[in-house]
């Protein structure tokens, strides 16, 4: 007894073409580029039936259905623009995303077609969803500022300073949106005991009740770093469980490009804000801030050589500023934050420094502020970052 | 950001009817050719398919299972709901539900733990 | 239900090829789908549409099907590759897993 005529879905056709099917003869069915079969909504990778005794197919006749690459996934600080025509997901359809503007950048062009395997794929060939990327560096402030010898900042000033509460208070500098960069005396004992580490951003006034909390996922503390026995390599960095919202309060600042270098010569400003000691003793209620010009490294060691600071001593992983008068300086309580530069080129803010050590006198004559120089740990930072 | 997360007891005596509710993120429920699957696995053992729904409300059990189950969905409120009649102590298991997306299951919940115990 | 059947374990040492097989009735016919599970954590799609890799998943996994058998290759295995790996295919309209597979990496 034959099997009736199959016939062809729609957008496909039928492979072999007989007169007659008989007994266990057989045909597939193959659909056309940008269409799959599907039977139900599962998809098929290849077709065929077999006519059997009773005269009937084995299976039904599967659909050529159009590829849908359904509805794109949100894309994390962004959204997605439909150009093809409004929800239109279907094969060669396009579609754009784009990042919040002002905070957020993309690093490709965003646009997206449904290809015929059934996945957004970008002109790169990527099937992975494109990534905003914080925009670093952007301050309200503009130089001029005088911790020691500091005066307020504003909001928007300073949106990568966060404050570190522990059993002291220290500081830290947002460098991505997950990623905080500080100094390994101010987190040492916490890679363990990271429960007591309290993350806040978004704040100016120390003491505020709004503000942005993070909690740390993971500590690392550099591996050259000796607690107790000076400061070399006095640089850490903390892995936020969350990654933080961006906006104008709160921003990562840049790490430095090679050519910063060039930015941190000696007598060039840098600025550093913080929370800690002012003139008058006491921690700071509200986020200072001072602009202090780099100090020639060999003037520096040599004051600290005629002045020691027990145990420490200036090494070449270090940058030195202040004035020789004093009277500017970072001081306790400012660890870990950072010291910033203007890339007068990308007119975006770098991270030179990282508050260390100094005095116990801070902002004596000739009591410069030490700190970690940040470009000689850019290999180490971006290990950390891309192997987490 | 695609997200999926079960909820639903963590204890179930035998003979009840167990409830699991999946709450998804990031897709639709209702558009393109997306589903959304119940699997499990008892303890220290392999994975199980029980059911799905497609966004064509397309629905399939595990043919062992199929008196047992139910599998519905709430476009508006983003959630597949499961349940499970005359639990039994070896339906003990974790119970995830994950999308799926041309034929693969590409995004999984962190999973459930449900124990069926007098 | 159709059965998928992988072996057991698997050991390999780091940095040489692992190959997984999953074995069912005219499996090559159908779409094959890989998993990696580690301890503690919900699967992970590794291979879809036999020999697909979706976004995230590193180069040296790979996929092949034909025949009976659909197989997994880990390339230059490392030690977090370390997990239980699951074959899934479609019969129908429902979906059947593997056995399940071991890797483990020798120290």
């Known amino acids: 007894q034959p099997c009736p005529d199959p016939t062809a879905p729609p957008n496909g056709h039928i492979s072999p073409v007989q007169a007659t099917y008989v007994l266990k003869d057989s045909f597939s069915v193959f659909c056309k580029t940008g269409f799959e079969l599907l039977q139900g909504s599962v998809p098929l990778k290849s077709f065929t039936a077999v006519c059997q005794k009773d005269g009937s197919w084995d299976r039904p006749i599967p659909e050529c259905s159009i590829i849908d690459c359904g509805p794109p996934d949100d894309l994390p600080n962004g959204h997605v623009d439909y150009i093809t025509g409004p929800e239109v997901t279907t094969y060669k359809a396009v579609i754009q995303y784009s990042c919040e503007e002002t905070f957020y950048t993309m690093s490709s062009n965003g646009k997206y077609v449904c290809e015929a395997d059934g996945f957004w794929t970008s002109s790169k060939g990527e099937k992975s969803l494109p990534v905003c990327k914080p925009v670093c560096g952007l301050s309200t402030h503009t130089s001029g500022g005088r911790i020691i010898g500091g005066q307020p900042a504003k909001p928007g000033d300073f949106p990568w300073q966060v404050l570190l509460l522990g059993e002291t208070t220290a500081a830290g500098a947002l460098i991505h949106d997950d990623w905080v960069l500080t100094a390994a005396h101010a987190v040492y004992g916490k890679t363990e005991a990271m429960s007591s580490l309290d993350i806040r951003m978004g704040i100016l006034k120390r003491l505020s009740l709004i503000y942005t909390q993070a909690w740390p996922e993971a500590v690392f503390i550099h591996e050259g770093y000796t607690h107790g026995a000076g400061f070399d390599n006095d640089i850490a960095l903390i892995k936020l469980k969350n990654k933080v919202t961006i906006n104008r309060n709160i921003m990562p600042i840049c790490l430095p490009r090679k050519e910063a270098a060039s930015l941190m010569k000696t007598d060039f400003v840098g600025t550093v804000a913080g929370w800690g000691l002012t003139q008058k003793g006491f921690l700071a209620r509200n986020l200072m801030f001072v602009d202090i010009p780099i100090v020639d490294h060999q003037k520096c060691a040599t004051a600290y050589t005629k002045q020691p600071y027990p145990g420490a001593k200036v090494t070449v992983n270090m940058l030195c500023a202040g004035l020789d008068r004093g009277g500017k300086d970072s001081c306790r309580g400012d660890a870990g934050g950072a010291l910033v530069f203007l890339d007068n080129e990308t007119q975006r803010w770098f991270v030179g420094g990282i508050v260390s050590w100094g005095s116990i006198n801070c902002g004596g004559s000739e009591q410069y502020g030490v700190y970690t120089k940040v470009t000689n740990y850019i290999p180490w930072i971006e290990n950390i970052i891309n192997n987490f | 950001q695609v997200t999926l997360k079960e909820s639903g007891p963590v204890l179930v005596k035998p003979t009840e009817t167990l409830t699991l509710t999946c709450t998804v993120s990031?897709?639709?429920?209702?558009?393109?050719?997306?589903?959304v699957s119940w699997i499990r696995q008892p303890p220290g053992k392999a994975l199980e398919w029980l059911a799905h729904?497609?966004?064509?409300?397309?629905?399939s059990y595990r043919t062992s299972l199929k008196s047992r189950l139910t599998i519905s969905k709430d476009t508006s409120k983003n959630q597949v709901v499961l349940t499970m009649t005359n639990m039994d102590p070896v339906d003990t298991a974790t119970y995830y539900c994950?999308?799926?997306?041309?034929?693969?299951?590409?995004?999984w919940g962190q999973g459930t733990l449900v124990t069926v115990s007098s | 239900q159709p059965v998928l059947t992988q072996p057991p374990s698997v050991s390999v040492s780091p940095g040489q090829t692992a190959s997984i097989t999953c074995s069912g009735d005219?499996?090559?016919?159908?779409?094959a789908y890989w998993y990696q599970q580690k301890p503690g954590h919900s699967p992970v799609l590794v291979i879809y549409?036999?020999?697909k890799r979706p976004s995230g998943i590193p180069g040296r996994f790979s996929g092949s099907n034909s025949g009976n058998t659909a197989t997994l290759t880990i390339s230059g295995t490392q030690a977090m590759d370390e997990a239980d790996y699951y074959c899934?295919?479609?019969?129908?309209?429902?979906?059947?897993f593997g056995t399940g597979t071991k890797v483990t990496v020798l120290a």
């Open positions: 549409q036999d020999n």
């Open positions: 729904i497609f966004s064509s409300d397309e629905k």
């Open positions: 005219k499996l090559g016919d159908k779409f």
């Open positions: 990031g897709f639709s429920l209702s558009r393109g050719k997306m589903g």
């Open positions: 994950a999308r799926i997306r041309a034929g693969g299951i590409d995004y």
């Open positions: 899934q295919a479609w019969d129908s309209s429902t979906a059947v």
